[in-house]
Interface confidence: medium
Amino acid sequence: KFSKQSWGLENEALIVRCPRQGKPSYTVDWYYSQTNKSIPTQERNRVFASGQLLKFLPAAVADSGIYTCIVRSPTFNRTGYANVTIYKKQSDCNVPDYLMYSTVSGSEKNSKIYCPTIDLYNWTAPLEWFKNCQALQGSRYRAHKSFLVIDNVMTEDAGDYTCKFIHNENGANYSVTATRSFTVKDEQGFSLFPVIGAPAQNEIKEVEIGKNANLTCSACFGKGTQFLAAVLWQLNGTKITDFGEPRIQQEEGQNQSFSNGLACLDMVLRIADVKEEDLLLQYDCLALNLHGLRRHTVRLSRKNPIDHHS
């Protein structure tokens, strides 16, 4: 399923993007899944749809639930699901794990902390930043556009950082906060030729006709923050975006993990409703960085049904 978790705090603005992407010209319809009730587009409503965006201005705990978005084009429809949870504000300083965005890692050279999800909002500088609930003060901290820069990073700078900004909608202001952990790496990073962990070269993946299938391309690129690292899929040597088969999509956004200190990325290729012709395609997992490119090829084969003869 094309599903995405989103969360926010009551009485704050929350804006959610449909997990299924489409051209700006495509219409997007939103529904509350439990009741199949259409979300209005009129901005006078507290919760309303605006193209690919679903806006809670402000959010209430009762808004929690699964929302369906349908991207409609002249030739196809794509359905996505937004799993929205609105939490009550905490009285104490601690930010619970379920409100935390992905952890970012920094070093003496690179100490940017991006404010999560801010690109979805209509905000104006400056951002306010807090560490462990204390407002950041001092010349070492610089709020720059949508991120915080910390000069001369030290291990003591590790902790939970909260950004606070104001979303403006038709003259009305709504507060938004987002928190993520920041860890400090002392070791010197390095970059190496990409190593693809999965899939294996020339792997054959068994799939069932009519079912959905996922292929994951995972690669590691060195230690520490990588200036350039990417993984992606190609079909028969063609970019997914150019191949023109709406059933086959790359998962938007790449997960960066530091397994054993290594900087690794993965990209999932989702094939909906596998068809016979999909078995004829060549699926290439590509990993590239400043050193160059490595490619592992996967092919699909039909999974034989289990023989139930006694």
């Epitope: 990417a230 028969n236 970019k239 150019d242 060549q282 400043l290 050193h291 160059g292 490119l293 490619r295």
Partner: nanobody, 121 residues
Framework: EVQLVESGGGLVQPGGSLRLSCAAS????????MGWFRQAPGKEREMVAV???????KYADSVKGRFTISADNSKNTAYLQMNSLKPEDTAVYYC???????????????WGQGTLVTVSS
């Protein structure tokens, strides 16, 4: 083999603009990543901007907000629009690419010959 040919370099005053082009030709070329690097006299070659899979862009901190990389797939061409140029942008600018021949398991970057950009009053 892929040939990359840069054009558009020249002399420009501080605060001015230039647009570099990089045309890829040779074997059937489907660029996975195209980028611009630069090398100033006495310095190491550094990455300026790259465009991955025709949609994801990355920039060096020193050029963010001033330079824009783009690509035209139909022409196998990458562009670098350089605005608000500074004297420290003076360098030889190289186009580089990684292409997509399906038989390749690992490929080094292909490089152009470079085009000189001089920012001076």
């Amino acid at each position: 083999e892929v040939q990359l040919v840069e054009s558009g370099g020249g002399l420009v005053q501080p605060g001015g603009s230039l647009r570099l082009s990089c045309a890829a030709s040779g074997r059937t070329f489907s660029s996975i990543v195209m980028g611009w690097f630069r090398q100033a006299p006495g310095k190491e070659r550094e990455m300026v901007a790259v465009i991955i899979d025709s949609r994801t862009t990355k920039y060096a901190d020193s050029v963010k907000g001033r330079f824009t990389i783009s690509a035209d797939n139909s022409k196998n061409t990458a562009y670098l629009q350089m605005n608000s140029l500074k004297p420290e942008d003076t360098a030889v600018y190289y186009c580089a690419a990684v292409g997509g021949a399906t038989t390749v398991t690992a490929s080094e970057w292909d490089w152009g010959q470079g085009t000189l950009v001089t920012v001076s009053s």
